[in-house]
């Protein structure tokens, strides 16, 4: 089931999903001067089953001026520099779908893709937040938001993260300022929580993210 809205915005922070739940849509958006081909898909879809998931449909962009550039190839390195990256600058790679059943990895770029990726997330999706470079996190460990279904409505939990403008090299400093207790996930809330497997795997993954630094992110 699709989440009704987008994940919360945190000032000076970016978010990413480590893997995308089945049913997630990624809009086929093109950079300026290009547009989706007339016979092209509106979006890519994470589809499959518990043992194997993959992105269905292919995004293709064509020049707005001359409508014949419909090939789909991976951008060259210089083309990739123009795009906002979804990869974190750390040795950690996106989770393989095999290690997280029912999920897809970050899809590869397509030629002349827009700089911003527009996802439509589904219930149970977890996204992780981190302060952008030059900002300091007033929180130890990963901050996350989960799309939950409660009383027939979807909502995202509030990420436990505040980013301040102090120039620090460490994203998660040893000393942190106290902050008000953010929204938690009460045990009694059972309608459409993330499955235990999802939560355990993703929490373990998140623990490895402490030292990693996001660059400019898709939001």
């Amino acid at each position: 089931e699709l989440c009704d809205d987008d994940p919360p915005e945190i000032p000076h922070a970016t978010f990413k999903a480590m893997a995308y739940k089945e049913g997630t849509m990624l809009n086929c958006e093109c950079k300026r001067g290009f547009r989706r081909i007339k016979s092209g898909s509106l979006y890519m879809l994470c589809t499959g089953n518990s043992s194997h998931s993959s992105w269905d449909n292919q995004c293709q962009c064509t020049s707005s001026a001359t409508r014949n550039t419909t090939k789909q190839v991976t951008p060259q390195p210089e083309e990739q520099k123009e795009r906002k990256t979804t990869e974190m600058q750390s040795p950690m790679q996106p989770v393989d779908q095999a290690s997280l059943p029912g999920h897809c990895r970050e899809p590869p770029p397509w030629e002349n893709e827009a700089t911003e990726r527009i996802y439509h997330f589904v219930v149970g999706q977890m996204v992780y937040y981190q302060c952008v470079q030059g900002y300091r996190a007033l929180h130890r460990g990963p901050a996350e938001s989960v799309c939950k279904m409660t009383h027939g409505k979807t909502r995202w939990t509030q990420p436990q993260l505040i980013c301040t403008g102090e120039m620090e090299t460490s994203q998660f400093p040893g000393e942190e300022k106290p902050q008000a207790s953010p929204e938690g996930r009460p045990e009694s809330e059972t309608s459409c929580l993330v499955t235990t497997t999802d939560f355990q795997i993703q929490t373990e993954m998140a623990a490895t993210m402490e030292t990693s630094i996001f660059t400019t992110e898709y939001q």
Partner: antibody, heavy 114, light 107 residues
Framework: QVQLQQSGAELVRPGTSVKMSCKAA????????IGWIKQRPGHGLEWIGD????????NYNEKFKGKATLTADTFSSTAYMQLSSLTSEDSAIYYC???????WGQGTLVTVSS | DNVLTQSQKFMSTSVGDRVSVTCKAS??????VAWYQQKPGQSPKALIY???YRYSGVPDRFTGSGSGTDFTLTISNVQSEDLAEYFC?????????FGGGTKLEMK
């Protein structure tokens, strides 16, 4: 919560034009295409076209080229559709849609009559 | 243009029944099909995207299936509030097109 609020009903003369609006709330307006749909009794639903407010791109159904003009104002998060040279065939309910057709406005009824 | 045909304009059903609404495309659309429900005097409401995925808040008695050119919306355990008109739509290629609609009514 995502909402698409459309302007009120219009009674217009043949040969004139009409411009209706669709104000989006609850999501990032510049991220998603806004589509426009025509509905007439006995004629079902017809896709008119769509506009991407972020890049100001438009796509039109050939049938509505020259009839409909789609625009968007990112400052007010509002999409507009203007219909020109109106005839009785244009009498219909017009819907705007957002976020890949997941959300629909309440519709604007256009009645063309002399 | 890709023509979507909903061969049955009307379907009669009873509360508790299982009913299947069909939609046939003139050209292959993969799974790029959506289903909408429209009640009199209301806007269409999105039920299904990508042929088989439910939108949030849509009861699980609504299920979509199919790929290529043949698609089905199945309503199991029909409720009185399900009496409405159902439309399919393809968004695989421009211009996007809709089926003519199938009206579900009580026997």
């Amino acid at each position: 919560q995502v909402q698409l609020q459309q302007s009120g009903a219009e009674l217009v003369r043949p040969g004139t034009s009409v411009k209706m609006s669709c104000k989006a709330a609850g999501y990032t307006f510049t991220n998603y295409w806004i589509g426009w749909i025509k509905q007439r009794p006995g004629h079902g639903l017809e896709w008119i076209g769509d506009i991407h407010p972020g890049g100001d791109y438009t796509n039109y159904n050939e049938k509505f080229k020259g009839k409909a003009t789609l625009t968007a104002d990112t400052f007010s998060s509002t999409a507009y559709m203007q219909l020109s040279s109106l005839t009785s065939e244009d009498s219909a309910i017009y819907y705007c849609t957002g976020r890949n057709f997941a959300y629909w406005g309440q519709g604007t009824l256009v009645t063309v009559s002399s | 243009d890709n023509v979507l045909t909903q061969s049955q304009k009307f379907m009669s059903t009873s509360v508790g029944d299982r009913v299947s609404v069909t939609c046939k495309a003139s050209q292959n659309v993969g799974t790029n099909v959506a289903w909408y429900q429209q009640k009199p005097g209301q806007s269409p409401k999105a039920l299904i995207y990508s042929a088989s995925y439910r939108y949030s808040g849509v009861p699980d008695r609504f299920t979509g299936s199919g790929s290529g050119t043949d698609f089905t919306l199945t309503i199991s355990n029909v409720q009185s509030e399900d009496l409405a008109e159902y439309f399919c739509q393809q968004y695989n290629s421009y211009p996007y097109t809709f089926g003519g609609g199938t009206k579900l009514e009580m026997k």
